[in-house]
């Protein structure tokens, strides 16, 4: 039994780091393998993650962490019974993938303005709480070409757009994702999408 693709890990910078790797053949990850992880720090203890299958030879492990600070560094040991298959390290702050925003809501009752709001996925005491920026994707269910991205570079989790920038009388969907420049993170997954019917009063033409 050998590791074909070494584990790579990303952290949500809150409580979970996810490591993925591939073995050289079909493997029952949960029964055959264990990933041990330990903070490089005084009095820290090794903790065990039981991996799950992720395709035939692929494994994924969700490492539970109480919290993360920028200096944290973990040792990782991948075991198959008594055999050490791979040894490595992982610094969560250098491999951050933020949590996806939630509770995306479209408010359509604000005088021809669409107000989109969502929730910051982090609690106020987490470092990322005040460092997230967002991308909002709006698209038409009827017209695949009607697809747009709005970059929200301010901290408030909301976006206002004129309803007239979208076509009237058709349904749209929106979703939002986050990233943090401070840690040069990857983008989060997209939030679940939300749907609304876009309608607004056309301005009267004056002759």
């Amino acid at each position: 039994m050998k590791v074909l693709q070494e584990p790579t890990c990303v952290s949500d910078y809150m409580s979970i780091s996810t490591c993925e790797w591939k073995m050289n053949g079909p493997t029952n990850c949960s029964t055959e393998l264990r990933l041990l992880y330990q903070l490089v720090f005084l009095l820290s203890e090794a903790h065990t993650c039981i991996p799950e299958n992720n395709g035939g030879a692929g494994c994924v492990c969700h490492l539970l962490m109480d919290d993360v600070v920028s200096a944290d560094n973990y040792t990782l040991d991948l075991w198959a019974g008594q055999q050490l298959l791979w040894k490595g390290s992982f610094k969560p702050s250098e491999h951050v993938k933020p949590r996806a925003p939630g509770n995306l809501t479209v408010h359509t009752n604000v005088s021809d303005t669409l107000l989109l709001t969502w929730s910051n996925p982090y609690p106020p005491d987490n470092y990322l709480y005040n460092h997230l920026t967002y991308a909002v994707n709006i698209w038409s269910e009827n017209d695949p070409a009607d697809f747009r991205i709005y970059n929200v570079t301010y901290l408030e989790p909301s976006l206002r757009i004129a309803a007239s920038t979208l076509k009237s009388g058709i349904s749209y969907r929106a979703r939002v994702r986050a990233w943090a420049q401070c840690y040069n993170t990857t983008w989060s997954e997209w939030s679940p999408s939300t749907k609304w019917h876009n309608s607004y009063r056309e301005p009267f033409e004056q002759h």
């Epitope: 992880y37 903070l39 005084l42 009095l43 820290s44 203890e45 490492l63 109480d66 919290d67 200096a71």
Partner: antibody, heavy 122, light 107 residues
Amino acid sequence: EVQLVESGGGLVKPGGSLKLSCAASGFTFSDYGMHWVRQAPEKGLEWVAYINSGSSKIYHADTVKGRFTISRDNAKNTLFLQMTSLRSEDTAMYYCARFPTVVAARYPMDYWGQGTSVTVSS
Amino acid sequence: DIQMTQTPSSLSASLGDRVTISCRASQDISNYLNWYQQKPDGTVKLLIYFTSRLHSGVPSRFSGGGSGTDYSLTISNLEQEDIATYFCQQGNTLPYTFGGGTKLEIK
């Protein structure tokens, strides 16, 4: 409710021995590391020893190394401090304290006992 | 060993006052700084860990801050029950070491 109750303190002559106990309740004792900390009369706190949940990591302060031994019995939810070759400077209130061995290891001694008094005097 | 220097060693303040206690480490302790309260009967309780994190059940009038070698504990609105001795402790390196304590009294 987390409870730590120390016992075994008392008056002992220099060179003598004493064994302190700390009975734990209200939490899963075998999941936690444990410390002993002492406080000499009218003085500050001094760390004495640490033992992890499975007894595989044990550390003692230089001031007590070779004389004091920390141990634990997880089946009986009890922490011990065996003290030998006692000196007058070991006179202190001895506290046991719980240490969460959580992943991030950022946590301190989060619950302390009420202490047991040790007096070393001829 | 890391030396922890706590100031002042004693402090007299009035109820409702804002009180600050300082703690200096002899080397960088990377925010592994905890604060404990010892009541006159000897009872020791954790207040704040990792510089600024409030232990469960501790009133929000207690707060902590600092970095590197310099740290502080602030009680924003002093109450009668806060009469105690306060100790800082570094958790960065063994042996763990404590400050000398600050005895807080009411004027």
